[in-house]
């Protein structure tokens, strides 16, 4: 070996100075008599080496690196050898920090593995090999006096937890526990825990199960779940409190917590849930009233709440067939009475013949919102119910009676916007209980089966805004019927558009006769079109060669017009504008020339 490096310390605080010396022996005869010693840290040459020849002929270079900012680097002592750098010796330098105090030390007792598992947070990176040791001792009191030491627990590399096996534990007796961290720059110790392993016991959760329905037990109410749990047997003798959490499977709802529940409850009816909804449930327990850790949440149990019978009001309306008055078409609409009114599976219309107690004849069972049935001759009334698996809604009686009530007056309709119509009326005297408003396409597309209807429960109402199934440029027939206690009034109807279309084109102008100063024009009116409002008037426009314009307004029934006061032998451009309340449109332009003064009139 020609050279040898010695350093003040191979491991230092990051950023601290370090001093190194390199001595080259005299017997390295192949070297220059006065070799220049160079220093290199990693790949970089380092200036500042102070070189001297010692009395024994050896060469020494000393360098001080003011700040070692590399966590690991090689320091080399070199000589120039021809064109290359020859390394004579090198040392590994390391820099870092002493270990921080480990914090958040906590332990839990696992009764299944019979071990105390402690974990901690090691603190910031030291950049140096750092060992952690979990140290503990047995103590009779509150850990002020140290009893038998327990064998150190050394975690596997990189782990921040360690298990003290049962043979080193004393249950129901305190233990002092702390973590010691050590590296080349120092040692640190966490604050000491003083604990009885049983006070940090973490139990296994019970297993949730659905309760087997017993024949004598009442089924759960709507929005309720019956469940039970099987405690973790090895923890059965430990007093515990438990809590249940649940949430609907669908949607973004967060967990709702129920508790505390005694472990021994073993079975439980959970209510106040949404009916007919699938729920996810979990349970966990903790030793209580003595200290302990919460168990993990149990595996999920998925259960569905029973549904509730529909809680709806059924608004009804009916029509008789004109050809067969005993054939009735009944319509209805469910109106929820509560926020959660229950699922509707279907509807049943039934009739109970008088004198036949209990005998109910179903007239129809449907999922639709209407049905047609033959009304038995003696039937004046039927009952309508909505049903699901949990039961039926309260029956709605439907009475078929003659129209004996007074009629409403001054029925009128007006457009609000292209998709709504306002229908208004003057209420009759006495006030009705309410009104049925029906609407659908007017002629020629009218159809009884395609009508929309609504019930207005307020008998004092003087109008109703129709917002459903209204489209522009369509003629609607609107029928309003007042409803009384046991009868109804005669129906009234009105026709209206929510938005009318301007005429699509004006009639073509034709020249019938022409003279020197006049011209007779005629046209064939456009046939009326559905969705287009009737014409209100025509305007005829004519312009001479000097670009002077003239016009005349004609009523909508006009079929022709004579232009007077024209100049002879002059050119005129004429067009007709057809107008309605919805707008106007122009015909094509007719160009004509009046006759010369010497010419004869043309008829």
């Amino acid at each position: 070996e020609c050279g040898h490096i010695s350093v003040s310390a191979p491991i230092v605080h990051l950023g601290d100075p370090i001093t190194a010396s390199c001595i080259i022996k005299q017997n390295c005869s192949h070297l220059d008599p006065e070799p220049q010693i160079l220093w290199r840290l990693g790949a970089e040459l380092q200036p500042g080496g102070r070189q001297q020849r010692l009395s024994d002929g050896t060469q020494e270079s000393i360098i001080t690196l003011p700040h070692l900012n590399h966590t690991q680097a090689f320091l080399s002592c070199c000589l120039n050898w021809g064109n290359s750098l020859q390394i004579l010796d090198q040392v590994e330098l390391r820099a870092g920090y002493p270990p921080a105090i480990p914090h958040n030390l906590s332990c839990l007792m696992n009764l299944t593995t019979s071990s105390l598992i402690c974990q901690w947070e090691p603190g910031p990176e030291t950049h140096l090999p750092t060992s952690f040791t979990l140290k503990s001792f047995k103590s009779r009191g509150n850990c002020q006096t140290q009893g038998d030491s327990i064998l150190d627990c050394v975690p596997k590399d990189g782990q921040s937890h360690c298990c003290i096996p049962r043979k080193h534990l004393l249950l129901y007796q305190n233990m002092g526990i702390w973590v010691q961290a050590e590296n080349a720059l120092g040692t640190s110790m966490s604050p000491q825990l003083c604990l009885d392993p049983m006070d940090v016991v973490k139990l296994e959760p019970p297993m949730l199960r659905t309760m087997d329905p017993s024949p004598e037990a009442a089924p759960p109410q709507a929005g309720c779940l019956q469940l039970c749990w099987e405690p973790w047997q090895p923890g059965l003798h430990i007093n515990q409190k438990c809590e249940l959490r649940h949430k609907p499977q669908r949607g973004e709802a967060s967990w709702a917590l129920v508790g505390p529940l005694p472990l021994e409850a073993l079975q439980y009816e959970l209510c106040g849930l949404l009916p007919a909804t699938a729920y996810t449930l979990q349970i966990r327990c903790i030793r209580w009233p003595l200290p302990g850790h919460w168990s993990d949440w149990s595996p999920s149990l998925e259960l569905r709440t029973t549904e509730r019978a529909p809680t709806v009001r059924l608004d009804t309306w009916w029509r008789q067939r004109q050809l067969d008055p005993r054939t009735v078409q009944l319509f209805w609409k469910p109106v929820p009475l509560e926020e959660d009114s229950g699922r509707i599976q279907g509807y049943v219309v039934s009739w109970r013949p008088s004198g036949q107690a209990g005998a109910i004849l179903p007239l129809c069972n449907t999922t639709e919102l209407s049905c047609t049935f033959h009304l038995p001759s003696e039937a004046q009334e039927v009952a309508l119910v909505a049903y699901n698996s949990a039961g039926t809604s309260r029956p709605t009686p439907v009475v078929f009676s003659e129209s004996r009530g007074p009629a409403l007056t001054r029925l009128h309709a007006m457009a609000r916007d292209p998709h709504s119509l306002w229908v208004g009326w003057e209420p009759p005297n006495p006030w009705p209980q309410g009104y049925v408003i029906e609407w659908g396409l007017g002629p020629p597309s009218a159809s009884n089966s395609n009508k929309t209807w609504r019930m207005e429960q307020n008998g004092r109402a003087t109008g109703f805004l129709l917002k459903e199934n209204i489209r522009p440029f369509q003629l609607y027939e609107i029928i309003v019927t007042p409803l009384y206690q046991d009868t109804m009034g005669p129906s009234q109807h009105v026709y209206a558009y929510s938005q009318e279309m301007a005429p699509s084109h004006a009639p073509e102008l034709h020249l019938k006769h022409i003279g020197k100063t006049w011209a007779q024009l005629e046209w064939v009116p456009e046939p009326p079109e559905l969705g287009k409002s009737p014409l209100t008037h025509y305007t005829i426009f004519w312009t001479n060669a000097q670009n002077q314009s003239f016009s005349a307004i004609l009523n909508a029934s006009s079929r022709g017009f004579v232009l007077h006061g024209l100049e002879p032998a002059s050119l005129y451009h004429i067009h007709l504008m057809a107008a309605s309340q919805a707008g106007a449109t122009n015909s094509t332009v007719l160009t004509l020339m009046t006759l010369t003064p010497e010419g004869s009139e043309l008829h």
Epitope: T113, S114, H237, N239
Partner: antibody, heavy 118, light 107 residues
């Protein structure tokens, strides 16, 4: 000091009934599971039944299931064992015991002898 | 059900001897094993719970070990007052079973 005092033992004919009692003192009775263990003459120990601190959980040995009922009155610090349809093989010293959190019988009463014989 | 097999059923030993009694469970019971001592005409007394924990007031010559299915009670130096019958009991799952007992007699 924990004390458990059994009473109610005695001679009974097969098919008869007896009710054993165990008066507890020296600890918070309502916080602990309690149990009955029996020992037939010259034989080993046999677990009979246990009862949870509030009385909601009551496991039984198969040999007594349906005939014996364990109960407790936390207000009186007393444990009971109602024994019906007694058989000759139920003859034993019946011990009342306080259970620990890990299922160990921490303290035992002195026992009461039940003899089933015609 | 978890059955408990204790061996030997009896043994003779002298004062000062080291005595070992074993107990085997028919299936794993973690550390849920307890040891009791019973003297004639007396109620049993808890010695060791949870396999290796010495009950308060029990001399330290008694120790327990094992886990899973195989367990041992050791008396390091037998004393005159230790001649008795010893029982093991599992408390992992109901029904609880006791071992058949080991009678320790004076040689």
């Amino acid at each position: 000091e924990v004390q458990l005092l059994e009473s109610g033992g005695g001679l009974v004919q097969p098919g008869g009934s007896l009710r054993l009692s165990c008066a507890a003192s020296g600890f918070t009775f309502s916080l602990y599971w309690m149990g009955w263990v029996r020992q037939a003459p010259g034989k080993g120990l046999e677990w009979v039944s246990s009862i949870s601190s509030s009385g909601g959980v009551t496991p039984y040995a198969d040999s007594v299931k349906g005939r014996f009922t364990i109960s407790r009155d936390n207000s009186k610090n007393t444990l009971y064992l109602q024994m019906n349809s007694l058989r000759a093989e139920d003859t034993a010293v019946y011990y009342c015991a306080k259970l620990g959190e890990l299922g160990q019988y921490m303290f035992w009463g002195q026992g009461t002898l039940v003899t089933v014989s015609s | 059900d978890i059955q408990m097999t204790q061996s030997p059923s009896s043994l003779s030993a002298s004062v000062g001897d080291r005595v070992t009694i074993t107990c085997r469970a028919s299936q794993g019971i973690s550390s849920y094993l307890n040891w009791y001592q019973q003297k004639p005409g007396k109620a049993p007394k808890l010695l060791i719970y949870y396999a290796s924990n010495l009950q308060n007031g029990v001399p330290s010559r008694f120790s327990g070990s094992g886990s899973g299915t195989d367990f041992t009670l050791t008396i390091s130096s037998l004393q005159p007052e230790d001649f008795a019958t010893y029982y093991c009991q599992q408390s992992f799952y109901y029904p609880f079973y006791f071992g058949g007992g080991t009678k320790v007699e004076i040689k």
